[in-house]
């Protein structure tokens, strides 16, 4: 791992009870095509070890969802951010599901060892569990 | 080519005959501005020379389309997945229409040499062949 | 930068007058998580410093956005491209949001030193300049 | 082998409703759309209107008015209503199913045609 | 709408020669990567017949003596060489947009 080739790439576990909207991720081969080399997971959320320029991308399919459903629901917002250390606590992406059931979005972000990203789903709907639906990654790109 | 930075971004080429739903790509300098620089095209389809976990993206948009066109044709789905060899087929990645006409992603997956990848687009759309709507492309990340 | 590491994530900064569709883009540290590490800004344009192969992203939300409103102002869209010189001008990437407030996409792309990239956005509406919405960048690849 | 089969009436009077029926074989209504198209030797082929296989219709401007496309997917039937009707609508009425692709609005398989005359 | 102007109106061409008739957009129906116009010929009581579909593919079962060509606003159908069971009227319709419309025919005599 030495050359920073820190990457990872989650799948939906589950969401968190009623008052937490955060989205719990699991990872390993055993799963399916989900893995980490180099972060970490910290109760389904994703740690990071190596401090530099990540890509970080992600994909979020709401359960048995038509645009309908999505429409009548609306607000649906989910947002990827650093949760922890308290002090660089920052929302990186932000994407509303409006009439759609699919969001998927990917940005560069300077990401620093220790730094936990969370990802909030807020809203009512149920996020599918598909591993080709919902998924979390993030790749080491440059220090 | 040693360092494993295989790539390929792929242009449309056609879709296929009606009981078929994969979409048939074509890279190259002389068509654009796609290429493959270590991946091949087999009958249209990208397959892998190289072991790896990659960054697979994708952008497909439905030709002539409205939002009232998509949702009157719904569902139209896209499909990211290994088609061949059978023994390792599998869905990547999947996005549907709903009341869009354009959708993009992309994940981080493990493939292997030989791994052919199809993109299935299900519904009765034609997708655009602008080369800046509708594109699908894989990067090598690390071993 | 000699190993070819260029990147750049950028926030918006403005847009042009109203003949002018395109975004007006910042980048650096004192402003946020955005920075340049190779590509340079030219009164808001992204400029390239190193040929080869990048990955383009880029998310723009449309400001104080519901579904209604989108489609009340039809049509939006959104395309980056190179600008100049103008001899290699193209359109890269276009995404046009229907009834949806957010575009995101991402595509692999040869880019020269020189090359300025543009993001143009037409409509009537306005973009959002929260940093976690309307982003843009780059990362070199490979030669 | 596909096939459209249209009845409906040849004369109409003045003011009155038009109505015919396609009955489909060969192929299924879930999954492709009908078209509506007449033929009249002042005004050439006209489009009418369409059902897609979702069940959603479209129509030209000019008869949304007093047109109306309906089906019944499991009896593969599709109903045409065409209220008002002068004598400028004597014509061919005709169903035709669009291609596979649902954007492609083009007729790859026609009925056999209605004459309709409008006359008291 | 959009308005599809054929020409000519009427021709006649001998046995194994070449006919063509040309079809006039009042704008353009090239769109993301296609052309959305296609061909069609009725012969006299009977329903048009689908030829040839954005712009330059066959139809399934239509000889291939028939050839389209085209994009932007100018179209050409081209018979060649024409035979005896190719007299009838042509017509050129775009899809564009809705509503699609029908050029007004050129109807083919055959020498």
């Known amino acids: 791992e030495s050359l920073g080739w820190d990457v990872a790439e989650l799948q939906l576990n589950h969401t968190g009870p009623q008052q937490d909207p955060r989205l719990y991720w699991q990872g390993g081969p055993a799963l399916g095509r989900s893995f980490l080399h180099g972060p970490e997971l910290d109760k389904g959320q994703l740690r990071i070890h190596r401090d530099g320029i990540y890509m970080v991308h992600i994909q979020v399919t709401l359960a048995i969802c038509s645009s309908t459903t999505a429409s009548r629901h609306h607000p649906t917002t989910l947002a990827v951010g650093i949760c922890s250390p308290a002090s660089r606590s920052i929302s990186l992406l932000r994407l509303s599901f409006h009439q759609g059931c699919t969001i998927a979005s990917q940005r560069l972000t300077p990401l620093a060892r220790g730094d936990t990203l969370c990802t909030n789903l807020t809203g009512t709907l149920l996020p599918s569990r598909n591993t080709d639906e919902t998924f979390f990654g993030v790749q080491w790109v440059r220090p | 080519e040693s360092l494993g930075w295989d790539v390929a971004e792929l242009q449309l080429n056609h879709t296929g005959p009606q009981q078929d739903p994969r979409l048939y790509w074509q890279g190259g300098p002389a068509l654009g501005r796609s290429f493959l620089h270590g991946p091949e095209l087999d009958k249209g389809q990208l397959r892998i020379h190289r072991d790896g976990i990659y960054m697979v993206h994708i952008q497909v948009t439905l030709a002539i389309c409205s939002s009232t066109t998509a949702s009157r044709h719904h569902p139209t789905t896209l499909a990211v997945g290994i088609c061949s060899p059978a023994s390792r087929s599998i869905s990547l990645l999947r996005l549907s229409f709903h009341q869009g006409c354009t959708i993009a992603s992309q994940r981080l997956t493990p493939l292997a040499r030989g791994d052919t990848l199809c993109t299935n687009l299900t519904g009765t759309l034609l997708p655009s062949r602008n080369t800046d709507e509708t594109f699908f492309g894989v990067q090598w990340v690390r071993p | 930068e000699s190993l070819g590491w260029d990147v750049a994530e950028l926030q918006l900064n403005h847009t042009g007058p109203q003949q002018d569709p395109r975004l007006y883009w910042q980048g650096g540290p004192a402003l946020g998580r955005s920075f340049l590490h190779g590509p340079e800004l030219d009164k808001g344009q992204l400029r390239i410093h190193r040929d080869g192969i990048y990955m383009v992203h880029i998310q723009v939300t449309l400001a104080i956005c519901s579904s209604t409103t989108a489609s009340r102002h039809h049509p939006t869209t959104l395309a980056v491209g190179i600008c100049s010189p103008a001899s290699r001008s193209i359109s890269l990437l276009r995404l046009s949001f229907h009834q949806g407030c957010t575009i995101a996409s991402q595509r692999l792309t040869p880019l020269a030193r020189g090359d300025t990239l543009c993001t143009n956005l037409t409509g009537t509406l306005l973009p959002s300049r929260n940093t976690d919405e309307t982003f843009f960048g780059v990362q070199w690849v490979r030669p | 082998q596909v096939q459209l089969q249209q009845s409906g009436p040849g004369l109409v009077q003045p003011s009155q409703s038009l109505s015919i029926t396609c009955t489909v074989s060969?192929?299924?209504?879930?999954?492709?759309?009908v078209h509506w198209v007449r033929q009249s030797p002042g005004k050439g082929l006209e489009w009418l209107g369409v059902?897609?296989?979702?069940?959603?219709?479209d129509y030209n401007a000019a008869f949304i008015s007093r047109l109306s496309i309906s089906k019944d997917n499991s009896k593969s039937q599709v109903f045409f209503k065409m209220d008002s009707l002068q004598s400028d609508d004597t014509a061919i009425y005709f169903c035709?199913?669009?291609?596979?692709?649902?954007?492609?609005?083009?007729?790859?398989?026609w009925g056999q045609g209605t004459s309709v005359t409008v006359s008291s | 709408d959009i308005v599809l102007t054929q020409s000519p109106a009427s021709l006649a061409v001998s046995l194994g020669q070449r006919a063509t008739i040309s079809c006039r957009a009042s704008k353009s129906v090239s769109a993301s990567g296609y052309t959305w116009m296609h061909w069609y010929q009725q012969k006299p009581g009977q329903a048009p017949k689908l030829l040839i579909y954005l712009a330059s593919n066959l139809e399934s079962g239509v000889p291939a003596r028939f050839s389209g060509s085209g994009s932007g606003t100018d179209f050409t159908l081209n018979i060649h060489p024409v035979e005896e069971e190719d007299a009838a009227t042509y017509y050129c319709q775009h899809s564009r947009e809705l509503p699609p419309t029908f050029g007004g025919g050129t109807k083919l005599e055959i020498k």
């Open positions: 035709a199913r669009n291609p596979h692709y649902g954007n492609l609005n083009a007729m790859d398989y």
């Open positions: 060969g192929f299924s209504l879930t999954t492709y759309a």
């Open positions: 059902i897609w296989s979702t069940g959603i219709t």
